[in-house]
């Protein structure tokens, strides 16, 4: 899977969308997990409602919701009041039984407030200079990672 | 109609070869899973696997990994199950099935005829 | 993997009586099973999903029940297409097992 990268401002909510084939993914739950270092498992944030048919409902854990068009075929995920520590890898999937299939790989950027004065430097994004493989552009405010580019800080 | 329609029976040796078909009519092949399962000869329904035409993702049982291979070609609407290397016990009766979707789940709703393959030298 | 578990492996019932076929997983299937009929030389037939959906063009005599672990499909009076294998599967989990079958004969 490729990576898509999705920058929102601190403070502010960021959108993420997901799309899939309506027809292929039908029946199945979906779910919004965070990538627990580069090979580690993928946590559960929060999923679709247990009913498929009540998908469309907004389910929120903490300030993470997520909403399940079924028919159009698009999973969105919203992380309302943006913090530097919600940046990172994240996956959307779908559920069937005990097992989850990949529909999209999201990189979450958190990009500092301009209107914010304090200090900005607990703020993390890929650099330009970093690492990472498989990439494509997609725009919300939201870009794939550039060939080269790595999803997780260099850890010391 | 809704049918899936299956190649007909055939008759190899050990080592040798195999494709069978099964062609969908009546519906949107590319929008519903495929599966194939065996019945050997007097016995019960194995399920083998199962293929998305539409993007020919792919899962098999792992007691059928790696001995067989499905696919499919949505230009002609046409799901395929393969052998390599043919072998006595694959002598058996083989269906394909479309998954009928559900709220959470999938039954084989339609059946294609059977194709029975036997393989003896 | 999921191993269904049909009981009994023969059943001798005799026409207009009552047929009770049992279906045991070893783990939790949710709802998400299937029953099918079929007959010598046919193939499989789907007559229940969901564990308890009739589907199109099944006689209200056929119906499912069950959650979980266990499944029931009864036959509320046989009549004399009915006499054949049936087997449940489950659907919940990959790889999609069937079991072992219950055929039901003419007593």
């Known amino acids: 899977h490729n990576t898509t990268v999705f920058q929102g401002v601190a403070g502010q909510s960021l959108q993420v969308s997901c799309p899939y084939d309506s027809m292929k993914h039908w029946g199945r739950r979906k779910a919004w997990c965070r990538q627990l270092g580069e090979k580690g498992p993928c946590q559960r944030v929060v999923s679709t409602h247990n009913l498929w048919l009540l998908s469309f409902l907004r389910r929120w854990n903490g300030s993470t919701a997520i909403t399940d068009d079924t028919l159009g075929g698009t999973l969105t995920i919203t992380l309302r009041n943006l913090q530097p520590h919600d940046a990172g890898l994240y996956q959307c999937q779908s559920l069937h039984g005990s097992e989850a299939d990949t529909l999209r790989k999201v990189l979450v950027e958190v990009l500092a407030d301009p209107l914010d004065h304090r200090d900005a430097g607990d703020l993390w994004f890929p650099g330009e200079s970093e690492s990472f493989e498989d990439a494509h552009v997609e725009h919300s405010i939201s870009r794939s990672l550039l060939e080269g580019e790595i999803p997780f800080p260099p850890t010391s | 109609e809704v049918q899936l329609v299956q190649s007909g029976a055939e008759v190899k040796k050990p080592g040798e070869s195999l494709k069978i078909s099964c062609k969908g009519s009546?519906?949107?092949?590319?929008?519903?899973?495929i599966g194939w399962v065996r019945q050997m000869p007097g016995k019960g329904l194995e399920w083998m696997g199962i293929?998305?035409?539409?993007?020919?993702?792919?899962t098999y049982s792992p007691s059928f990994q790696g001995q067989v291979t499905i696919s499919a070609d949505k230009s002609i609407s046409t799901a395929y199950l393969q052998w390599s290397s043919l072998k006595a016990s694959d002598t058996a009766m083989y269906y394909c099935?479309?998954?009928?979707?559900?709220?959470?789940?999938?039954?084989?709703?339609?059946w294609g005829q059977g194709t029975m393959v036997t393989v003896s030298s | 993997e999921i191993v269904m578990t049909q009981s009994p492996a023969t059943l001798s019932v005799s026409p207009g009586e009552r047929a009770t076929l049992s279906c045991r997983a070893s783990?939790?299937?949710?709802?998400?099973l299937a029953w099918y009929q079929q007959k010598p030389g046919q193939a499989p037939r789907l007559l229940i999903y969901?564990?308890?959906t009739r589907a199109t063009g099944i006689p209200a005599r056929f119906s499912g029940s069950g959650s979980g672990t266990e499944f029931t499909l009864t036959i509320s009076s046989l009549q004399s297409e009915d006499f054949a294998v049936y087997y449940c599967?489950?659907?919940?989990?990959?790889?999609?097992?069937f079991g072992g079958g219950t055929k039901v004969e003419i007593k």
């Open positions: 099935a479309r998954a009928k979707m559900l709220d959470d789940g999938y039954a084989f709703d339609i």
């Open positions: 009546g519906y949107s092949f590319t929008s519903y899973w």
């Open positions: 293929i998305y035409p539409g993007d020919s993702d792919t």
């Open positions: 783990q939790s299937v949710s709802s998400n």
């Open positions: 969901g564990a308890s």
């Open positions: 599967q489950q659907d919940d989990n990959y790889p999609y097992t």
